[in-house]
């Protein structure tokens, strides 16, 4: 199809080489009020569309994305050629940063339902650059945490070093929905609830004498509880003796509950005490069996191919540790009688 009639938008993605970050493009199809099939209120009622409105369907997946090769080759269907780019409804997600993402991306409806729809498309010219060291030292991360129940703020990474007085107008989206009253370089949250968690996008306009473009950043916001003040507790084993049958295989499970920590480095291991000696046992990897906002339960098993007489003289110790402290639980094996 002819893309010369598409409306054009220029975007800049400046990514940090230090951290993983994502990027999104919205299919901003020109419409006076709402995108029929994206169900996203992106234009204010007073904003004038650049083209005639698109008479779209309500099918959320009814939009097609293409990339325009720089060599003039035909348009390429994003889904077929770019595994690191995912289409979700009307949004294109870039999972990994890199200058190779630079290029022209075109979106348009799959179903052409009226003569006006032929020109109903948007061409987004994306420029991707690594962040220079000249950027401010304490720029906000693309992953930000908000402490539940307290006040907090979400900063636009590309503007986090600017004061409120200097900051340009910022357009914010949360999970693809326009936040029309959030217009500054940070969203101030009076009290943090779990619904504040999500993917936030901040846009602002930069211009020179020739043209203007949108600078965009994506922020993953997580709502968290305060760091635990407690050391982990062992839920299993509870008893310090365990009846076993000699010659049979045995699995002893250690389950421990770790309170939430922003920097989480849990330790769970088994070691064996035999008279004056003790050594760590190489056992299968620990696995998380339950994770909630407040805590995580981690399990690690010790496996004996067959219980020997020697094992009855030993103590099997589960050791768990977080940044606050450690807890141990020892188990003595006892032969089953009768």
């Amino acid at each position: 199809f002819n893309i010369s009639g598409c409306s054009t938008k220029k975007l800049l993605w400046t990514y940090s080489t230090r951290s993983e970050e994502e990027f999104v493009l919205f299919c901003d199809l020109p419409e006076p009020q709402k995108s029929h099939f994206c169900h996203r209120n992106r234009l204010s009622p007073k904003q004038v569309p650049e083209h005639l409105p698109f008479m779209g369907s309500n099918d959320l997946s009814d939009v097609q994305w293409y990339q325009q090769p720089s060599n003039g080759d035909p348009l390429e269907d994003i889904r077929k050629s770019y595994p690191h780019i995912i289409q979700d409804k009307c949004t294109l997600h870039f999972l990994t940063p890199g200058v190779n993402n630079s290029g022209s991306y075109i979106c348009r409806p799959k179903m052409i339902k009226s003569p006006y729809d032929v020109a109903c498309c948007v061409k987004m010219i994306l420029e991707v650059k690594p962040q220079t060291n000249a950027s401010c030292e304490y720029s906000a991360s693309h992953k930000q945490d908000l402490l539940l129940g307290s006040t907090g703020s979400i900063s636009c990474p590309s503007l986090s070093c600017q004061s409120d007085a200097q900051s340009p107008a910022v357009t914010w989206y949360k999970n693809g929905k326009l936040l029309s009253v959030e217009r500054s370089n940070r969203i101030v949250v009076d009290e943090v609830y779990d619904y504040h968690q999500g993917t936030y996008v901040c846009d602002y306009t930069q211009s020179d004498t020739v043209s203007s473009w949108t600078v965009r950043a994506v922020v993953q916001v997580r709502t968290i509880v305060g760091d635990t003040k407690l050391k982990p507790d062992i839920l299993d084993p509870v008893e310090d003796t365990l009846e076993v049958e000699l010659g049979k295989p045995l699995t002893i499970s250690c389950k421990a509950r770790f309170g939430f920590e922003r920097v989480f480095n849990p330790v769970i291991k088994w070691y064996i005490k035999d008279s004056d000696l003790e050594w760590e046992v190489s056992v299968p990897e620990a696995k998380s069996i339950k994770s909630t906002l407040k805590d995580e339960i981690i399990e690690r098993n010790i496996i004996l191919e067959k219980v020997t007489q020697r094992d009855l003289r030993r103590k099997f110790v589960c050791f768990v540790q977080n940044s606050i402290g450690n807890t141990t639980q020892s188990v003595q094996l006892k032969e089953k009688r009768g």
Epitope: P168, V181, D190, S207
Partner: antibody, heavy 113, light 111 residues
């Protein structure tokens, strides 16, 4: 800086356009608000224009005013002035939908028969 | 529509003393903190003092303090100076922008 102009004596029903000229920053990057103040009275919020050109008006101002912009100016059109629209009109750079730190000196509009 | 009700005028203050002006919003301002305070002297445009309910604007003396959340807000001026004689306005931002409004103003007279 910000400066309003276009205020003058008009007769009721004669449309009037006030202009706010900005320098030192780009209207592509900032939101702007209009506020008015009748003689001896308090401040009244009229409305806002976003960097994108989207406009929002105070409930009482809808239909009575139109805000538009060019690359360096923001216009406020009083569609059909009445004597109650006699006031000094200010434009101001805006943060998070409220007037912020850069205000013009204001321009006086008098509506009289 | 939103209504912002301020302390009735005038309010008297002695030089060196403290004065407080209240601003009551109905309904709550957006995010409980989208409230600004302005100072205006005759023949001049308003000057921003406080935004986000309690953040001091650049260049404003720390004698000015904003507090409050939701529907009740206060501007406190400590160590009052003669230059503080002016009319003070609160302005509230709401989840529906068309509800944004100013309070009626409170005149502070310094003796």
């Amino acid at each position: 800086s910000v400066e309003e102009s276009g205020g003058r004596l008009v007769t009721p029903g004669t449309p009037l356009t006030l202009t706010c000229t900005v320098s030192g920053f780009s209207l592509n990057s900032y939101d702007m608000s209009w506020v008015r103040q009748a003689p001896g009275k308090g401040l009244e919020y009229i409305g806002i224009i976003y960097d994108s050109g989207s406009t929002y008006y105070a409930n009482w101002a809808k239909g009575r005013f139109t805000i538009a912009k060019t690359s360096t100016t923001v216009d406020l059109k009083i569609t059909s002035p009445t004597t109650e629209d006699t006031a000094t009109y200010f434009c101001a750079r805006t943060l998070n939908t409220l007037p912020f730190n850069i205000w013009g000196p204001g321009t006086l509009v008098t509506v009289s028969l | 529509a939103a209504v912002l009700t301020q302390t009735p005028s005038p309010v008297s203050a002695a030089v060196g003393g403290t004065v407080s002006i209240s601003c009551q919003s109905s309904p709550s301002v957006y995010n409980n903190n989208r409230l600004s305070w302005f100072q205006q002297k005759p023949g001049q445009p308003p000057k921003l003092l406080i935004y986000y309910a309690s953040t001091l604007a650049s260049g404003v003396p720390s004698r000015f303090k904003g507090s409050g959340s939701g529907t009740q807000f206060t501007l406190t001026i400590s160590d009052v100076q003669c230059d503080d004689a002016a009319t003070y306005y609160c302005a509230g931002g709401y989840s529906t922008i068309s509800d944004n409004a100013f309070g009626g103003g409170t005149e502070v007279v310094v003796k």
